[in-house]
């Protein structure tokens, strides 16, 4: 392993379908790929009307987007699909919503020192 | 890299059951999802069920509900697909297919596909 | 059942043309969309997972977008290779459920 990274093994394994798709809700899911690419975790997951409700989670692909990121953060603003990955075993435990504020905001807008987390 | 390869072509009687092995190659084996997915010739391609050999369950899709049984034999890692009742519109090519990952993000990795022809 | 539907069913083109395929879902499918191309015999491969993500080893004239219910694979600079039949498959949820395909024919 390359020194500071996080190498990813395993993420939790969610499915929203379980019931319907007939696997386990929750598991722990051993990541492959290949031999050179690099591995995450993720989460998806819907916000209706200010109720969080998980998709999917589980191992993700080689992603640029993912590199170095320890924690599962999502950085759109009001995104159609909430989505976040990371680098480390299980990092996809905990996920939040953080928008990266626009510098043209009216500064009345607070920004949430803090993302938060859900799980 | 995972390999799968696929029992041979197979000629059955409507109202009869096929069997079709599916042999995976490559790292853990249990750790897998696979799926059956069939083309009847000149058609689109109908996913059929899965498998997580390590949960053992399958999933299996509405229409054929009933018919077709999915299991895994972690000793010999090999996946099966079995279709009972067959009809002549089960006359196809199988594919057993690899996941990305559980999540089911995309098949990549197919094998070479079985032809079972249904004919009186 | 989410229903797939494609647009073209098929259509022509010349090497070094552009062309864009459509794919629609019945209800969202969130991004949980995948591109395959088949060549008459063979399996399909996998193109596009996630609506854009390009699968390992997939040439770069490939690119996938959209999300929910509308999506499209485009072909930049199309190859001889390229001139196949393209499926896309939602991942959403079970029963996963296939377009009819689109064949790319050499005009």
């Known amino acids: 392993a390359i020194l500071g990274r996080s190498e990813t093994q395993e993420c939790l394994f969610f499915n929203a379908n379980w019931e319907k798709d007939r696997t386990n809700q929750t598991g722990v899911e051993p990541c492959y790929g290949d031999k050179d690419k690099r591995r995450h975790c993720f989460a998806t997951w819907k916000n209706i009307s200010g109720s969080i409700e998980i998709v999917k989670q589980g191992c993700w692909l080689d992603d640029i987007n993912c590199y170095d990121r320890t924690d599962c953060v999502e950085k759109k603003d009001s995104p159609e699909v909430y989505f976040c990955c990371c680098e480390g075993n299980m990092c996809n435990e905990k996920f939040s919503y953080f928008p990266e504020m626009e510098v043209t905001q009216p500064t009345s807008n607070p920004v949430t020192p803090k993302p938060p987390y859900y799980n | 890299q995972v390999q799968l390869v696929q029992s041979g072509a197979e000629v059955k009687k409507p109202g009869s059951s096929v069997k079709v092995s599916c042999k995976a190659s490559?790292?853990?084996?249990?750790?897998?999802?696979i799926s059956w997915v069939r083309q009847a010739p000149g058609q689109g391609l109908e996913w059929m069920g899965g498998i997580i050999p390590i949960y053992g369950t399958a999933n299996y899709a509405q229409k054929f509900q009933g018919r077709v049984t999915i299991t895994a034999d972690e000793s010999t890692s090999t996946a099966y697909m079995e279709l009972s009742s067959l009809r002549s519109e089960d006359t196809a090519v199988y594919y057993c297919?690899?996941?990305?990952?559980?999540?089911?993000?995309?098949?990549?990795?197919w094998g070479q596909g079985t032809m079972v022809t249904v004919s009186s | 059942e989410i229903v797939m539907t494609q647009s073209p069913s098929s259509l022509s083109a010349s090497v070094g043309d552009t062309v864009t395929i459509t794919c629609r879902a019945s209800?969202?499918?969130?991004?949980?969309l995948a591109w395959y191309q088949q060549k008459p015999g063979k399996a399909p491969r996998l193109l596009i997972y996630w609506a854009a993500h390009l699968q390992s080893g997939v040439p770069s004239r490939f690119s996938g977008s959209g999300s929910g219910t509308h999506f499209t694979l485009t072909i930049s600079s199309l190859q001889p290779e390229d001139f196949a039949t393209y499926f896309c498959?939602?991942?959403?949820?079970?029963?996963?459920?296939f377009g009819p395909g689109t064949k790319l024919e050499i005009k």
């Open positions: 209800q969202g499918v969130s991004r949980w």
């Open positions: 297919v690899k996941d990305l990952t559980w999540t089911n993000l995309g098949l990549d990795i």
């Open positions: 498959q939602q991942s959403y949820s079970t029963p996963f459920t």
């Open positions: 490559g790292p853990r084996f249990q750790d897998l999802s």
